[in-house]
């Protein structure tokens, strides 16, 4: 299911990098979140629960990430103009069932003031 544009601030700039915020409902217990740049998978994070409610976090395509009870943040560093693109949060929900996939995204504009190592 494609939901289109994120209805929240998806990109947070700091120190020449960007935090890309991928939100999900807090009822969701087990999921995979992928960060897509265009159609390419940049990062992913999978959260599963084992016996005794032990939480497992795995990444096949590792990026610096941060998990909360309703969001995954992916961090991109050393921004340059090539980072400008459409970015999508691709959420696959495993629990609660049934399996659902939802895609939200937005365009990352890169301005001079946000670049990492701008010449003075």
């Amino acid at each position: 299911e494609i939901n289109g544009s994120a209805n929240y601030e998806m990109f947070i700039f700091h120190n020449g990098g960007v935090q890309i915020l991928c939100k999900y409902p807090d009822i969701v217990q087990q999921f995979k979140m992928q960060l897509l740049k265009g159609g390419q998978i940049l990062c992913d994070l999978t959260k599963t629960k084992g016996s005794g409610n032990t939480v497992s976090i795995k990444s096949l395509k590792f990026c610096h990430s941060q998990l909360s009870n309703n969001s995954v943040s992916f961090f991109l560093y050393n921004l340059d103009h090539s980072h400008a693109n459409y970015y999508f949060c691709n959420l696959s929900i495993f629990d609660p069932p049934p399996f659902k996939v939802t895609l939200t995204g937005g365009y990352l504009h890169i301005y001079e003031s946000q670049l990492c190592c701008q010449l003075k």
């Epitope: 939901n3 409902p25 969701v28 929900i93 609660p96 069932p97 049934p98 399996f99 659902k100 996939v101």
Partner: antibody, heavy 125, light 108 residues
Framework: EVRLVESGGGLVQPGGSLRLSCATS????????MHWVRQVTGKGLEWVSA???????YYSDSVKGRFTISREDARNSLYLQMNSLRAGDTAVYYC???????????????????WGQGTTVTVAS | EVVLTQFPATLSLSPGERATLSCRAS??????LAWFQQKPGQAPRLLIY???NRATGIPARFSGSGSGTDFTLTISSLEPEDFAVYYC??????????FGPGTRLEIK
């Protein structure tokens, strides 16, 4: 009012098989998660099985390994293959559909808002 | 498995009276609860979803409330066609999806 139409019920001996079907032409079938729910005469409702829009399947413990749910979206149809039937499977079987929509931090569940009229399965020798 | 308990098992009231039906869940199901009405020989009909949202075509005299583990279905003024069996159902912690045992609403 949207209608689902079940068929395939009947009398079968213990250990036998039946295939139930459920069809509609009146709503966007492929956007619904579909379920089978059964009811013994004079008793309550018991969930049997479900299939999600992505084809993911779920079963109650009482039918796991004996029943198989499937769907054919191009035909707006739902099926339940019932094998190794037991007397305890005797019931009216309803097909029903519900929807879950995820948008950002919102998880909407709209309930089982479409139902068929039911088809009777009797397992007896 | 989430167990749903409904009470009372039978409720005897007269047309025009207010009916209050209760459903209790064995664990927190937030607001992911639905209510169904079933008449003899008919399929169940969805009345309320998300604990408090009326389904399409359901009269305003039906209302739902509650969250977590305790839920209520209220019929503000009973009509003759409201006498039936009412079931609550959860579909957030599953499989299995579970239904309550039902409350029979009968004419006094």
């Amino acid at each position: 009012e949207v209608r689902l139409v079940e068929s395939g019920g009947g009398l079968v001996q213990p250990g036998g098989s039946l295939r139930l079907s459920c069809a509609t032409s009146e709503f966007i079938f492929n956007s619904y998660d579909m379920h089978w729910v059964r009811q013994v005469t004079g008793k309550g409702l018991e969930w049997v099985s479900a299939i999600g829009t992505a084809g993911d399947t779920y079963y109650s413990d009482s039918v796991k390994g004996r029943f198989t749910i499937s769907r054919e979206d191009a035909r707006n149809s739902l099926y339940l293959q019932m094998n190794s039937l037991r007397a305890g499977d005797t019931a009216v079987y309803y097909c029903t559909g519900d929807r879950t929509v995820v948008r950002g931090v919102n998880y909407y569940y709209y309930g089982m808002d479409v139902w068929g009229q039911g088809t009777t399965v009797t397992v007896a020798s | 498995e989430v167990v749903l308990t409904q009470f009372p098992a039978t409720l005897s009231l007269s047309p025009g009276e207010r009916a209050t039906l209760s459903c209790r869940a064995s664990q927190n199901i937030r607001s992911y609860l639905a209510w169904f009405q079933q008449k003899p020989g008919q399929a169940p009909r969805l009345l309320i979803y998300g604990a408090s949202n009326r389904a399409t075509g359901i009269p305003a005299r039906f209302s739902g409330s509650g969250s977590g583990t305790d839920f209520t279905l209220t019929i503000s003024s009973l009509e003759p066609e409201d006498f039936a069996v009412y079931y609550c159902q959860q579909r957030i912690s599953w499989p299995p999806i579970t239904f309550g045992p039902g409350t029979r609403l009968e004419i006094k």
